[in-house]
């Protein structure tokens, strides 16, 4: 529980968190460790989320070895017409899960974002909203002539692939590679999900990289000029590192950003790339992640419905990736 | 750029009221709180209170009740700080200022002399 | 709820400055130091204990733990001469500290 003996970490490598839980150094710099979320227990090796501004309330006596993660004290946020107090969490709406954290609001989904890759059992693979559900779902819609499902597996709907390209089918295994899904964050550190099969067992398998559509800080509509109903991608801003779970990037970036529209349009990445980011971690370890590098930005009324002040920034394709 | 803009210093006599503005710029004036901060000179900085942007309710801190009044004025994306029956200790800067991640943003400030 | 911070504080050019700023379990909470020059309005320089606002330079540093919450300046130079002041949140209320006059030598 506490730190006075050596360092002793499992063998196995870091432990993977779930969505939205930090991965961090425990208490005693020893093992990097699954953050304690809000309202769980910690102890000096099992730190509290730093990112969520939580930390271990021990209570009294102060020198009890078991705390309870609670959020820091700080500033309220307005959101929607209701004052959130800094650590409380809300549901803005059925999709978004939303936290306030002294005094700005970040959300994340809590509607998955897969992709899924025609098969031949579901060659047509459809996200429709079904009646009382929140989420979206998966259909497969049945050809109406069975000698087509063939061919089928080649026609992609040009939201969710690129291919296919006639080079891409090997022996036995047709390569396809869906777009990397939108950033799972509205501003600030993010992930991107693809689904390829292009390895050598033509297996599928998920990749992933971080994204940052826009910093949390910037203060984007500061930059719209009078008479202009939009910035899609500001002016590159000075050189800057990233963070990622109190790692920080070894290099700095002039990362490009997308800008806001304030005419009821989204603006999100159009072109991106993706390349390796080296983290410097406190404990020295460095770690290499592949990240999007956006190109441009584009501003488009393909929002989807129901007014959610989220909906016009996920679940939109990022088209033209270069990896 | 994102600003604050406040309305000229003020000399009042004791027991006049004065309006003080401040007036936004350069974001989305309702999705953050504006803040009322006092300066007598020479001394440190004390907080007043805050208003809603989105819903115009105001909190006042202890001691700045009853003769404080903080409103807004949507359509021109501007706070007033109003002071009935001036006193001479009321004589400060005020500032207003934005909060976000910490007060972010400041007024220049407005200086409200009091006269007896 | 209060936050005590030393009236003044001197350091050489070149030097490293330690402003303190205590609190009971200030830890608990974030906080914020602003800088104020004369005639000038505050300027925020560390926010959520340990974090700098993009423009700040990064010869400030804070730090937050137990009962006291310190902003550092390493390199301290004559343009860093000003009060600062600490503040942090209790409940929903801002509470601001008596602020420390800093003297570069």
């Known amino acids: 529980q506490n730190c006075s003996g050596p360092c002793r970490c499992p063998d196995e490598p870091a432990p993977r968190c779930p969505a939205g839980v930090s991965l961090v150094l425990d208490g005693c710099g020893c093992c990097r460790v699954c953050a304690k979320q809000l309202g769980e227990l910690c102890t000096e090796r099992d730190p509290c989320d730093p990112h969520k501004g939580l930390f271990c309330h021990f209570g009294s006596p102060a020198n009890r070895k078991i705390g309870v993660c609670t959020a820091k004290d700080g500033a309220p946020c307005i959101f929607g017409g209701t004052v959130y107090r800094s650590g409380e969490s809300f549901q803005s709406s059925c999709k978004y899960q939303c936290t306030c954290l002294d005094g700005a609001v970040g959300c994340m989904p809590l509607c998955s974002m897969d992709v899924r890759l025609p098969s031949p059992d579901c060659p047509f693979p459809r996200r429709v909203k079904l009646p009382g559900k929140c989420c979206e779902e998966w259909v497969c819609d049945e050809p109406k002539d069975q000698t087509v499902v063939g061919p089928a597996l080649a026609a992609y709907r040009l939201e969710d692939t690129f291919g296919p390209d006639p080079t891409m089918i090997r022996a036995n295994c047709l390569v396809q590679t869906t777009e990397w899904s939108a950033c799972s964050k509205t501003c600030g550190m993010g992930i991107s999900t693809r689904v390829t099969n292009d390895n050598a067992s033509c297996r599928l398998e998920k990749q992933s990289r971080l994204c940052m559509v826009r910093p949390c800080e910037a203060d984007l509509e500061e930059n719209i000029k009078k008479g202009k109903k939009c910035i899609r991608t500001p002016k590159i801003s000075k050189p800057i590192k990233f963070e990622l779970s109190g790692c920080t990037s070894m290099k700095t970036y002039r990362a490009k950003f997308c800008g806001v529209c304030t005419d009821g349009r989204c603006c999100t990445p159009h072109r991106t790339t993706t390349l390796p980011v080296e983290f410097k971690c406190p404990d020295g370890e460095v770690m290499k992640k592949n990240m999007m590098f956006i190109k441009t930005c584009a501003c488009h009324y393909n929002c989807p419905g129901d007014n959610d002040i989220f909906e016009s920034l996920y679940y939109r394709k990022m088209y033209g990736d270069m990896a | 750029e994102v600003q604050l803009v406040q309305s000229g210093s003020e000399l009042k006599k004791s027991g006049a009221s004065v309006k003080v503005s401040c007036k936004a710029s350069g974001y989305t004036f309702n999705n953050y709180a504006i803040h009322w901060v006092r300066q007598a000179p020479g001394q440190g900085l004390e907080w007043m209170g805050w208003i809603n942007t989105n819903t115009g309710n105001p909190t006042y801190a202890q001691g700045f009740t009853g003769r404080f009044v903080f409103s807004l004025d949507t359509s021109v994306r501007t706070a007033y700080l109003q002071i009935s029956s001036l006193k001479a200790e009321d004589t400060a800067v005020y500032y207003c200022?934005?909060?976000?991640?910490?007060?972010?943003?400041w007024g220049q400030g407005t200086m409200v002399t009091v006269s007896s | 709820y209060v936050l005590t911070q030393p009236p003044s504080v001197s350091v050489s050019p070149g030097q490293t400055a330690s402003i303190t700023c205590s609190g009971d379990n200030l830890r608990s909470k974030y906080a914020s130091w602003y800088q104020q020059k004369p005639g000038q309005s505050p300027v925020l320089v560390i926010y959520?204990?340990?974090k700098r606002p993009s423009g700040v330079p990064e010869r400030f540093s804070g730090s937050n733990s137990g009962n006291t919450a310190t902003l550092t300046i390493s390199g301290t130079q004559a343009m860093d001469e000003a009060d600062y002041y600490c503040?942090?949140?209790?409940?929903?209320?801002?509470?601001f500290g008596g602020g420390t006059e800093l003297t570069v030598l």
């Open positions: 200022a934005r909060v976000r991640y910490g007060m972010d943003v």
């Open positions: 959520q204990d340990t």
């Open positions: 503040q942090a949140w209790d409940s929903n209320t801002v509470v």
